[in-house]
């Protein structure tokens, strides 16, 4: 299963499959999950160890038992790949990194005026893997606002230097914001020519497809068909590049297919995993197991929850059955395509499903009235399980805000339902930023079920906490997945990085705004809060966030929309917003559903609405 | 020139039997999929069978599951659909088809195809 | 099995409009979508493959869109010899290759 647990002070002894350098464990974690062969990292960060070869190593680890022994070692950090996490499997990488330098070839270098501006520039090149820039602090005056694009034979930095006044980070084409744009058409019958970074095996053009937008060096491709002239050649996916980024040359070629990478997309990338199967084809490779399955399907779900499978044949020859029941045989390679591809036999072969972002059809958790004020307006993908809630009357307005959970759960606040309790007249956007965005194309989930919690009372502050159900599951991209539950009755977790997002007032007697805003908040005691709001009992069940001096708080139109904290890297919802004394009022926090208090009757209701476990647990 | 030709239609009573032959030309019949598809007369496109490269792997639509049989010749750059036990729904035009390679299964390359007949 | 729903089933357009066919998988089938062309008592033509990539000789004034489960053909400028019937077939969950139940497409 998902292991999303990191081990502090803690090293992996053994197992190394492929090290780098990066500049924090959750890098070294997504590497991790994106290797064919590891299932373990273990980070050095340059405090924890005075080997300047060794800062910022990165380890990554394979294991036939699925663990190593575990080390001590001060500062490092260790844990597990995130295959077979879901939703939470991402090449997107958005941190900014100050006082490091990433090296690696420097092929352009402009003066702009951030390091925003130098990231955004990283993602509209199409070259560009990682980036430096150069504050207006730097130490050398010439280098000063300097942003220096670049990129390595493995995408990752050629060394990572601790340097004063030098920010730096990756390109966000992993994460669908380039401007660039991409080219979706495939071409039959057409060979590119110049640099091949790598070759595997694949099935078909898409497959290598694929592989080739999640290579770092990947630009374009060349397919050889399974009818191409030269036996020793069919199925053959060469990866390629070019200095200029396109391909220089192209050859008509009878039963070859060409394209290009599809990193350069903006809104939606392919997902990094395979899930057609072929039939009449057996995929070669290292044995990892044989099963006696009933179906090619449950042989890609026994590969799929194998997580050292990479891929599968399931056999129909006769001497391979017993009863309804055929052998299922687990593999795995090197680079994680077959070694062999051979067709015309009585099987069907594909590929482990641990790497697709959809998961199962379930909420997510970790065992371990009121718009922004003060807040400055979020990104797009930056807080992809915001949903704005919106009723449709005569006219159509936003009402509230609401957190995607699950494929088809969204978790908001009671008092959005406040006479409104009709779930025809609701519709839920996902995936937006901009509320101006929304035309009568867009396109909206409708409530299947509403479900308040039994003990809310209309204007009472207590149990505002409601389930929606969407009458279809929704798909999850960059833009759209869920945010990850607390587990129950979290209380030991000290929350340091919380924000709430929303698209309310930014100031009480305000409108609606247009961008989704965002405002980082620290928490508040319950003790602290109780004695702002002496007319209000606090409970144990909320959770409260603001400034002292206040000028930063949710704001009426955010109701039901997230307060979350990232902890261990991860974003967890701790809190739904509810209720609050007007609007980033000094010494007047807001008030938040505590999101830990309700686990049980959220995986109580996700459960029991459809009869089957809803609940998918990461670690 | 690349081209699929059909032959073995006819009129046959409920019942009886019929073997469709598509003879291609014009390319290396042996690693290409091939299937057929029918469409009744007035009626869309359905998708009947398919038998992969070698002949080692063969499938087909439920609703001739265990009556009709597909199986090719590629010595004789030849595809066969035995059809037995027919019925007055099986009424259609057969049209073979060439499935691009490697699993892209477009069908690219289509026969004229061959009308059957089932009635009493 | 997977579901194709395409849409309109018929159509009515002059020489020389934009037209545009949907056609809607039951559930992702990521690209593998094709779209055909099929005259009265003629077999069907490839026209789109892969979703968006045009059969050698067909005229570019056919184009395919969309990835997942939505899917658009778009014909941009009408042509006499344009007119008629137009299916989607998915081949992701193969078998069966299934067809979208097609969409005429008539001269107004």
């Known amino acids: 299963g998902c292991l999303t647990q990191l081990y502090e002070n803690a090293f992996f002894r053994g197992g190394d499959v492929a090290s780098m350098y990066t500049p924090n464990a959750q890098y070294c974690q997504m590497r991790c999950t994106f290797h064919p062969r590891c299932l373990l990292f273990s980070f050095l960060p340059a405090s924890s160890i005075n080997d300047m070869e060794k800062r910022f190593g990165c380890f990554l680890k394979d294991s036939v038992t699925g663990t190593l022994p575990k080390v001590h070692r001060t500062g490092a950090v260790s844990g597990h790949s995130l295959k077979q996490c879901g939703h939470q499997i991402s090449a997107c990488h958005r941190d900014i990194y100050k006082g490091v330098d990433m090296r690696g070839v420097n092929f352009n270098v402009s003066k702009v005026s951030s390091v925003e501006e130098c990231q955004k520039r990283c993602t509209s090149n199409i070259r560009c893997q990682f980036f430096s820039y150069a504050t207006q602090t730097f130490h050398k005056a010439e280098y000063r606002n300097n942003c220096l694009l670049k990129y390595s034979p493995g995408g990752t930095p050629t060394a990572i230097k601790v340097l004063s006044n030098v920010e730096s980070g990756f390109s966000l084409k992993p994460c669908a914001l380039s401007e660039i744009g991409c080219h979706m058409n495939i071409f039959q019958h057409l060979a590119f020519s110049d640099v091949d970074v790598a070759r595997v095996l694949t099935p078909d053009a898409f497959v290598c497809r694929t592989i080739c937008t999640y290579h770092p060096n990947c630009l374009f491709f060349t397919f050889y068909t399974n009818v191409w002239k030269i036996e020793s050649q069919r199925n053959v996916c060469l990866l390629k590049t070019s200095e200029s980024g396109t391909p220089s040359s192209s050859t008509p070629q009878e039963n070859t297919i060409s394209g290009y990478s599809l990193l350069t997309c903006k809104r939606t990338l392919p997902e990094p995993c395979h899930s057609k199967i072929y039939p009449g084809v057996d995929f070669g490779g290292e044995e990892l197991n044989v099963t006696f399955v009933k179906g090619v399907n449950v042989c890609q779900e026994t590969c799929t929850k194998m997580i050292r499978c990479q891929f599968f044949t399931y056999s129909l020859l006769p001497e391979d059955c017993k009863e309804e029941k055929c052998k299922c045989f687990l593999r795995l390679s090197m680079d994680g395509s077959p070694t062999r591809i051979a067709y015309g036999t009585q099987g069907s072969s594909g590929y482990s499903l641990r790497l697709c972002n959809t998961g199962d059809n379930s909420v997510c958790t970790t065992k371990t009235s009121t718009r922004i004020v003060g807040g400055t307006n979020s990104s797009w993908g930056e807080w992809p399980w915001q949903v704005s809630l919106q009723v449709k009357l005569t006219a159509q307005r936003h009402l509230c805000g609401g957190s995607l959970i699950g494929h088809q759960w969204v978790l908001t606040a009671a008092h959005c339902f406040d006479g409104l309790p009709l779930q025809d007249v609701w519709r839920i956007y996902s995936g937006i930023l901009n509320l101006s965005d929304i035309t009568k194309d867009t396109p909206f989930s409708q409530i299947k079920e509403i479900i308040i919690h039994q003990n809310y009372k209309v204007s009472e502050g207590n149990h505002d906490i409601a389930l929606i159900k969407l009458q279809a599951p929704l798909n999850y991209t960059e833009f759209q997945k869920p945010i990850c539950l607390p587990s129950k009755g979290d209380t030991s977790t000290i929350y340091t990085n919380c924000w709430v997002t929303g698209w309310g007032f930014s100031k009480e007697k305000g409108e609606i705004q247009n961008i989704l805003q965002k405002v980082n908040i620290p928490l508040v005691t319950n003790e602290e809060c109780q004695k702002r709001y002496q007319d209000y009992k606090i409970t144990q069940r909320m959770v409260c966030a603001g400034y002292k001096e206040g000028g930063k708080d949710a704001c009426k139109g955010d109701s039901g929309g997230p307060l979350v904290c990232k902890h261990n890297g991860m974003w967890r919802l701790v809190g739904i917003t509810s209720w609050g004394e007007g609007c980033a009022r000094r010494e007047q926090p807001g008030v938040y559903t505590k999101v830990a208090e309700y686990m049980d009757w959220i995986l109580e209701k996700t459960q029991s609405s459809d009869g089957k476990a809803q609940m998918q647990s990461p670690a | 020139e690349v081209q699929l030709l059909e032959s073995g239609g006819g009129l046959v009573q409920p019942g009886g039997s019929l073997r469709l032959s598509c003879a291609a030309s014009g390319f290396t019949f042996s690693p290409y999929a091939m299937t057929w598809v029918r469409q009744a007369p007035g009626k869309g496109l359905e998708w009947v069978s398919v038998?992969?490269?070698?002949?080692?792997?063969?499938d087909y639509a439920d609703s001739v599951k265990g009556r009709f049989t597909i199986s090719r010749d590629n010595s004789k750059n030849t595809l066969y659909l035995q059809m037995n036990s027919l019925r007055a729904e099986d009424t259609a035009m057969y049209y073979c088809?060439?499935?691009?390679?490697?699993?892209?299964?477009?069908?690219?390359?289509w026969g004229q195809g061959t009308m059957v007949t089932v009635s009493s | 099995d997977i579901q194709m729903t395409q849409s309109p089933s018929s159509l009515s357009a002059s020489v020389g409009d934009r037209v545009t066919i949907t056609c809607r998988a039951s559930q992702s089938i990521s690209s593998y979508l094709n779209w055909y062309q099929q005259k009265p008592g003629k077999a069907p033509k490839l026209l789109i493959y892969?979703?968006?990539s045009l059969q050698s000789g067909v005229p570019s004034r056919f184009s395919g869109s969309g990835s997942g489960t939505d899917f658009t053909l778009t014909i941009s400028s009408l042509q006499p010899e344009d007119f008629a019937t137009y299916y989607c077939?998915?081949?992701?969950?193969?078998?069966?290759?299934?067809f979208g139940q097609g969409t005429k497409l008539e001269i107004k």
């Open positions: 038998i992969y490269p070698s002949g080692g792997f063969t």
């Open positions: 892969a979703a968006s």
């Open positions: 077939q998915q081949s992701y969950s193969t078998p069966p290759y299934t």
């Open positions: 088809a060439r499935a691009s390679g490697s699993y892209l299964d477009a069908f690219d390359i």
